[in-house]
Interface confidence: low
């Protein structure tokens, strides 16, 4: 059966031969070439068969011709457009790295029928025009010689001669567009205008000050220097900047305590309340402090428990009436005190110091009784006349047949004197055994005490 149509053609193919007939008999072959930029493995052939054109090898087709790698350029990169493989129709567009620029205007290569068009683009370093030093200044930190061009990234720094300061930027660098990053600075004479002092007024009367000249000022009532009362003219202006701020107090540091309210700044007149903890107490009466022009009054402090007015038994503080209003007092305070007649301090003196410690007053018993040992009739008198201090106990030895009352053998110096009173009393006894001597008193079955010849009998059964 004939084919009544021309052989079909893809847009990548070119039909070879002459095809001017209206019909084509069965078996007619149409042979195709690939268009420029395309290729196939062997010819593409269609055959007329049973009235229609069929491909002899359906898998065979014209595909884009590959070009290979377009080539890298130093100091630059390329990107592909129109595709993502190196084949016909794709374009490699080159861009230079920062600080480099294309030599020439063509920045691409195209994969064409005969391979890549154009040469590989070249990237050269960006250059900036030479720069000169400003008047009354010089260029530093440049490796370049004068009047030479600078490459991208290179920097020049300017310094001004003494008495001059830079107006503008002290450094500029060669940018990636071939221009300097900043305007060249000027060197201008250093001077400062008389400054306005907010909440203060000048003492110095000049209008313009030269470098290192000093400006003095004072602050209005209720204000204080932010830093100090004068400023120096420097190339960066007044240092420190003259300024007066409302008198204020720093946030108080209260070890072992907290305060409220918390403020960034405490102005004169502001009041805080503070609490102490962990066994600590406000060091002064009350627990408030006020910010004044001289700081916190009273100073907020937490101390260990203060000492109340000391109650000195058998003694007292010197200048008692003068001191009493100042109590309670803090740990560490001490006062001189005296002891009454018949009493002395633990150091053996009639006066000493009493100290406020974290455990209270020290010494705890400031005045101790002095006891002088009396003459013992019917006793041994090795201690006669000797002084003993409150709390001291001593042995008493009576002559045979005598003893302390109630068979005691020691006397103790107490707050009110000796206890019991040292005296040797006649003892009569009947023995349970045949022994004799002072020790037998304590073994006796029955003891009779003769006190001043009276008839009172105390029977002690052991």
């Amino acid at each position: 059966e004939d084919c009544n149509e021309l052989p079909p053609r893809r847009n990548t193919e070119i039909l070879t031969g002459s095809w001017s007939d209206q019909t084509y008999p069965e078996g007619t072959q149409a042979i195709y070439k690939c268009r420029p930029g395309y290729r196939s493995l062997g010819n593409v052939i269609m055959v007329c068969r049973k009235g229609e054109w069929v491909a002899l090898n359906p898998l065979r087709k014209c595909q884009k011709r590959p070009c290979g790698h377009p080539g890298d350029t130093p100091f630059g990169t390329f990107t592909l457009t129109g595709g993502n493989v190196f084949e016909y129709g794709v374009k490699a567009v080159y861009t230079c790295n920062e600080g480099y620029q294309l030599l020439g205007e063509i920045n691409y290569r195209e994969c064409d029928t005969d391979g890549w068009t154009n040469d590989i683009p070249i990237c050269e370093v960006v250059k900036c025009l030479p720069v000169t030093a400003p008047e009354n200044g010089k260029i530093v930190s440049s490796a370049m010689e004068p009047d030479r061009e600078y490459h991208f990234g290179q920097a020049v720094r300017f310094v001004c001669n003494s008495g001059y300061k830079i107006e503008g930027d002290e450094e500029m660098h060669c940018s990636d567009d071939g221009f300097w990053s900043k305007e060249k600075p000027k060197c201008v004479e250093i001077s400062c205008k008389s400054p306005d002092v907010i909440n203060g007024s000048p003492i110095s009367q000049k209008i313009i000050y030269k470098e290192n000249e000093r400006f003095q000022y004072k602050c209005n009532m209720g204000y204080e220097y932010s830093e100090r009362g004068d400023a120096v003219c420097t190339e960066s202006g007044w240092r420190p900047l003259p300024s007066c701020e409302e008198k204020s107090c720093d946030n108080p540091y209260i070890p072992n305590g907290d305060y409220s309210p918390l403020r960034i700044k405490h102005r004169t007149g502001d009041e805080i309340t503070y609490q102490c903890r962990n066994g600590f107490y406000p060091a002064t009466r009350g627990n408030t402090a006020k910010c004044t022009s001289t700081g916190w009054i009273p100073a907020p402090r937490c101390t260990l428990k203060p000492c109340d007015y000391p109650d000195i038994k058998h003694g007292g503080l010197y200048h008692e009436n003068m001191r009493r209003p100042y109590f309670p007092v803090a740990v560490g305070k001490y006062y001189s005190y005296y002891c009454d007649e018949h009493f002395e301090t633990p150091s053996g003196s009639y006066w000493d110091h009493i100290h406020c410690t974290q455990d209270g007053w020290s010494p705890a018993v400031p005045c101790l009784r002095k006891c002088y040992f009396p003459y013992l009739e019917n006793g041994y008198n090795q201690n006669h006349g000797r002084k003993f201090v409150q709390g001291k106990s001593i042995d008493v030895a009576c002559h045979p047949g005598y003893a302390l009352p109630k068979a005691q053998t020691t006397v103790t110096c107490m707050e009110n004197g000796w206890s019991p009173t040292p005296r040797c009393i006649r003892v009569s006894f009947t023995l349970g055994g045949g022994g004799s001597g002072l020790n037998d008193i304590f073994e006796a079955q029955k003891i009779e005490w003769h006190e001043g010849g009276g008839g009172s009998h105390h029977h002690h059964h052991h």
């Epitope: 903890r277 627990n287 428990k305």
Partner: antibody
Framework: QVQLQQSGPGLVKPSQTLSLTCAIS??????????WNWIRQSPSRGLEWLGK?????????YYALSVKSRITINPDTSKNQFSLHLNSVTPEDTAVYYC??????????????WGHGTMVTVSS | DIVMTQSPDSLAVSLGERATINCKSS????????????LAWYQQKPGQPPKLLIY???TRESGVPDRFSGSGSGTDFTLTISSLQAEDVAVYYC?????????FGQGTKLEIK
């Protein structure tokens, strides 16, 4: 056993003074290891601490800022009790009022003992 | 003032299950000098005053069952009841006693599911 016994009126007229007393048994108001507090509770404000008094060589008082201008807490050592006086009351002061102890020498500490509470209504 | 915020406002838990209540303070209640958190937990049942359960954030008050425990430090704290009992139905409050005015959370109502 330590107990706190509250007393005082349950109804106070606006602008008058609210006065409550808390009697302490088993402890001392001038104890060196406790502080004595007043706290109130209402649906609108929840639990609200009002202030406290305690003795450490002398008497200390702390009040909440919200009531500072109107409140006084007084210890009474002779009766071993402490009292709350809140003047210029408004219906906003309607609440259950509690006295409470924080019972630790190392102030501050939590409230370990509470009174039974007194419902106070401010109304004319 | 230090603001105490509890979550959730109410909680329903089955008997024997774990209940967890959170409390957040607007600033730290940890005192560095003694490394203690000044935070307490209370339980309040209807018609009764609050009862102290936990102090120093994690120390159980004497007589409080060991199913109650507290944890956390600085600004974030938790009260845990490990196995809920019927008698634990109450409102629970956290409270800071770090600085005056002492402040309480708004409370968490605990119910049985």
């Amino acid at each position: 056993q330590v107990q706190l016994q509250q007393s005082g009126p349950g109804l106070v007229k606006p602008s008058q003074t609210l006065s409550l007393t808390c009697a302490i048994s088993g402890d001392s108001v001038s104890s060196n290891s406790a502080a004595w507090n007043w706290i109130r509770q209402s649906p609108s404000r929840g639990l609200e601490w009002l202030g406290k008094t305690y003795y450490r060589s002398k008497w200390y008082n702390y009040y909440a800022l919200s009531v500072k201008s109107r409140i006084t807490i007084n210890p009474d050592t002779s009766k071993n009790q402490f009292s709350l006086h809140l003047n210029s009351v408004t219906p906003e002061d309607t609440a259950v009022y509690y006295c409470a102890r924080d019972g630790d020498y190392y102030l501050p500490s939590p409230f370990d003992l509470w009174g039974h509470g007194t419902m106070v209504t401010v109304s004319s | 003032d230090i603001v105490m915020t509890q979550s959730p406002d109410s909680l329903a838990v089955s008997l024997g299950e774990r209940a967890t209540i959170n409390c957040k303070s607007s600033q730290s209640v940890l005192y560095s000098s003694n490394n203690k958190n000044y935070l307490a937990w209370y339980q309040q049942k209807p018609g009764q005053p609050p009862k102290l359960l936990i102090y120093w954030a994690s120390t159980r008050e004497s007589g409080v069952p060991d199913r109650f425990s507290g944890s956390g430090s600085g600004t974030d704290f938790t009260l845990t009841i490990s196995s809920l009992q019927a008698e634990d139905v109450a409102v629970y409050y956290c409270q800071q006693y770090y600085s005056t005015p002492y402040t309480f959370g708004q409370g968490t109502k605990l119910e049985i599911k």
